[in-house]
Structure formats: C-alpha cells, structure tokens
C-alpha cells in the first residue's frame, strides 16, 4: 500500500521522500525566507481501506509574508492554549487542548493568516461530554457577568460577576456550572 | 510530560530473540509516535524503526527489516520491540522515545534496556 | 540514509567558555534538525529542534542555528553540567543520528 505524490505547495519545498510512498512515511513542508506556513506541516501517509494509502490532511499554505499583520486572542470556550502566546504575528500558531470533562472538535492547531484571521480551519470548539447544561444566568442591576458564551452554559465553564464603579459585590464573584446542571452560588448583588 | 517505563535488562545467547516493553504513562497514547533507538557499548545513537499507535503502523531502517517487529498495544499504552536472529554485535542498550504528534524529534525516553547477547 | 556528521569528535573547553558544535547534513534537510545532551548512563535529553527552537525548560545559553546542510550548537558559557556528549539527528528522510560530539572539560 502506498501514496500518491503529496499535495504540491507554491513557494515553499517538501521533504525529501522515495517511491513507492510506504504508508506510515511523513513528508514535511518548509516556505521559503519571505512566505510563512500556514497548516499542519507534516502530512503522514495513512491507508483507511488497507488497500489504498492517502495522505491524512491536505498541504499547508505558504503566504508572503506580512509584517504588518496581526490576529485577536483566540477564544475556544471550554478550552485553554497549550502553545502560543501574543502578539500573534503572521505565521505564528496557537494550539488547544480541552477541559477535563470537555472533547475537542475540528483541528487543535490554528495559524495567524495575511488576513488578521486564525486559519487555515476554523477555531476548536470543546464539547460537554455531560448532556447537562446550565440555564443562562440573569444579569444583575448596576453590573455586568462575563459568560463566554450566550444562553445555557456547559458544565466546567463559569462566569464572572462585576459591579460599576461606586457600587460593592456582595455574594460570589465566580459561579461555576456543575456536572448537575445547577450552577454552584447564587448570582451576586451589587450594593452602594 | 510523558514517562516512558521500559521492562528490565536482558541476556540472551546468539540466534534467540528478545521482546523489549515500553509503557507510557501520561499525555495520549494515540496521539504520539514511538521510535526505538539502541546505542551500543561506547556508540552512538541508532534509529531502528517506529510505530503510530493509534493506526498500527509500524515502519523501520532498512538494516533492521526483517529482524525488528514493532507492536503497541493501545488498552495499556505499551510499545513493544522484537528483535530476532540475535549476534554478539546487537549487545546495547535499547531506547524507546516519543515524539509528539509526527514532529520528528523525541520529546521524552524511556531509562533504556539493556540486551547483552553472549553464549 | 541521510549521513550526520559531526565534528570534532571530542571538544575541550573551560567552564564559562564558549562552546560551538557542528553537525553538516549529507544531504540538504532544511530545518529538520534536532540536539540532544546525554550523560553516562543517561537518556538523551531533547535540547533544541528545528534547528533553531529551545525544548521545554532548556537554559538559554543552549541556541541553535543553521539550515540546509551546516549546523551548530551554541553553549555561551558553559557550566559544569554542560559537559556530556551531544547528538544531532536529523528527521528530513525518516530519522538519522550523527556519532556524537564529547564535550569535556579542559
């Protein structure tokens, strides 16, 4: 079983490789001085059927490079960066894992493009792995929460209560949504 | 970080085969490749083959082909090395290593197995 | 195979000096290339990969550099847990390993 020549990629250079392509061979993709890579470097050579090999995601990008490019934080809710920190300049890469208790959909890499967008896919999302969800919390008078996200929350996630200024946070200031599907306080007053 | 466990050392006389073990613990075992490296006596490093766990693929040097089988084993996160035919000259210390994802260099080894070939 | 050269054999340097170790491809291997440290009885311990890049808590002092077919590890001043013998490998065409640089004290 082996593959097909790998994707081609403009202004940039694959790893040397022989044929056949056995399966199990990795081939790497590296730009030239000027241009960044943008996707997963290295494809892997994988047979699904056993009788046919095919390579196990398509080729990155090379983009010119923009030195005046940048990208905003990325925000995968129920999830955290285990690689990349800001600024996010053109090229640079950001990778996800999940909370306990949460699966990840869709790729755990993304790359600061040209464009001031995270790609070449789109951002992971992390799934509850509990069914359970917790409804959405009121806001509170002369206050504000920060949810991650709008309406019913996933267990593992939380959100953040904070007053205007002049007035005083009487209660918790983090509530989290439990596996129970209850949240763990009751929201906080804000109090002159 | 991964911790990789490898069985104990071994002595095993000329022609016989050896079975060396490699248990991971930590970080997912299917998302990582595992190599084995042996480096003789006063020698330097030695690629000898490697598999992906998680498609059961197993790829190695052309000097080892025929004589080196690669297993894992995914519901106890264990590698495993066989070499068979054994000569005086495969006495080394045997080295899994991981790499993450299909990056090409070893984040984590295991302590090494000694395999003493001797009549 | 891809051929990992490595040169001197054996390098002997003052604690606090400066030590440079070379590595030359025999094939061009972009920067697909890593350095490890091993000392007797050890493991190899990860220092540097694509080239260039610092592993996981590794001290400053160690940097990498080079592409294509020359590269070199750089340890700006060295410490007295810095002597040990050092690998390249490269990971272009499946994986290679150079014989060893021995850094030893002077």
């Known amino acids: 079983i082996s593959c097909g020549s790998p994707p081609p990629i403009l202004n940039g250079r694959i790893s040397y490789y022989s044929t056949p392509i056995a399966v199990g061979t990795v081939i790497r993709y590296s730009c030239s001085g000027t241009f960044r890579l943008i996707g997963e470097k290295s494809l892997l050579c994988i047979t699904k059927d056993k009788v046919d090999g095919t390579w196990d995601k398509p080729a990155p990008k090379c983009e010119y490079f923009n030195k005046y490019s940048s990208c905003p934080e990325p925000i995968v809710p129920g999830g955290y960066k285990i690689r990349g920190s800001t600024p996010y300049r053109h090229g640079d890469s950001v990778t996800f894992a999940c909370k306990t208790n949460f699966s990840m959909n869709g790729n755990k890499s993304v790359w600061c493009q040209a464009n001031n967008m995270w790609g070449p896919t789109r951002l992971p999302t992390c799934v509850s792995v509990f069914p359970l969800e917790c409804p959405a919390l009121p806001m509170i008078h002369n206050g504000h929460h920060t949810s991650e996200n709008v309406g019913s929350i996933a267990p593992g996630l939380s959100v953040t209560y904070s007053c205007e200024s002049g007035y005083l946070l009487v209660g918790e200031k983090i509530i989290n949504c439990l596996s129970s599907g209850k949240w763990s306080a009751v929201p906080p007053t804000c109090e002159e | 970080q991964v911790q990789l466990v490898q069985s104990g050392a071994e002595v095993k006389k000329p022609g016989s085969s050896v079975k060396v073990s490699c248990k991971a613990s930590g970080g997912t075992f299917s998302s990582y490749a595992i190599s084995w490296v042996r480096q003789a006596p006063g020698q330097g490093l030695e690629w000898m083959g490697r598999?992906?766990?998680?498609?059961?693929?197993?790829n190695y040097a052309q000097k080892f082909q025929g004589r080196v089988t690669i297993t894992a084993d995914k519901s106890t996160s264990t590698a495993y090395m066989e070499l068979s035919s054994l000569r005086s000259e495969d006495t080394a210390v045997y080295y899994c290593a991981r790499e993450e994802d299909i990056s090409g260099y070893y984040q984590d080894w295991g302590q090494g197995t000694l395999v003493t070939v001797s009549s | 195979e891809i051929v990992m050269t490595q040169s001197p054999a054996t390098l002997s340097v003052s604690p606090g000096e400066r030590a440079t170790l070379s590595c030359r491809a025999g094939?061009?291997?972009?920067?697909?290339l890593a350095w490890y440290q091993q000392k007797p009885g050890q493991a190899p311990r990860l220092l540097i990969y694509?080239?260039?890049s610092r592993a996981t808590g590794i001290p400053a002092r160690f940097s990498g550099s080079g592409s294509g077919t020359e590269f070199t590890l750089t340890i700006s001043s060295l410490q007295s847990e810095d002597f040990a013998v050092y690998y390249c490998?490269?990971?272009?065409?499946?994986?290679?390993f150079g014989q060893g640089t021995k850094l030893e004290i002077k």
């Open positions: 694509d080239a260039s």
């Open positions: 598999i992906i766990p998680i498609l059961g693929i197993a």
């Open positions: 490998q490269q990971y272009e065409y499946w994986y290679s």
């Open positions: 094939q061009k291997i972009s920067s697909y």
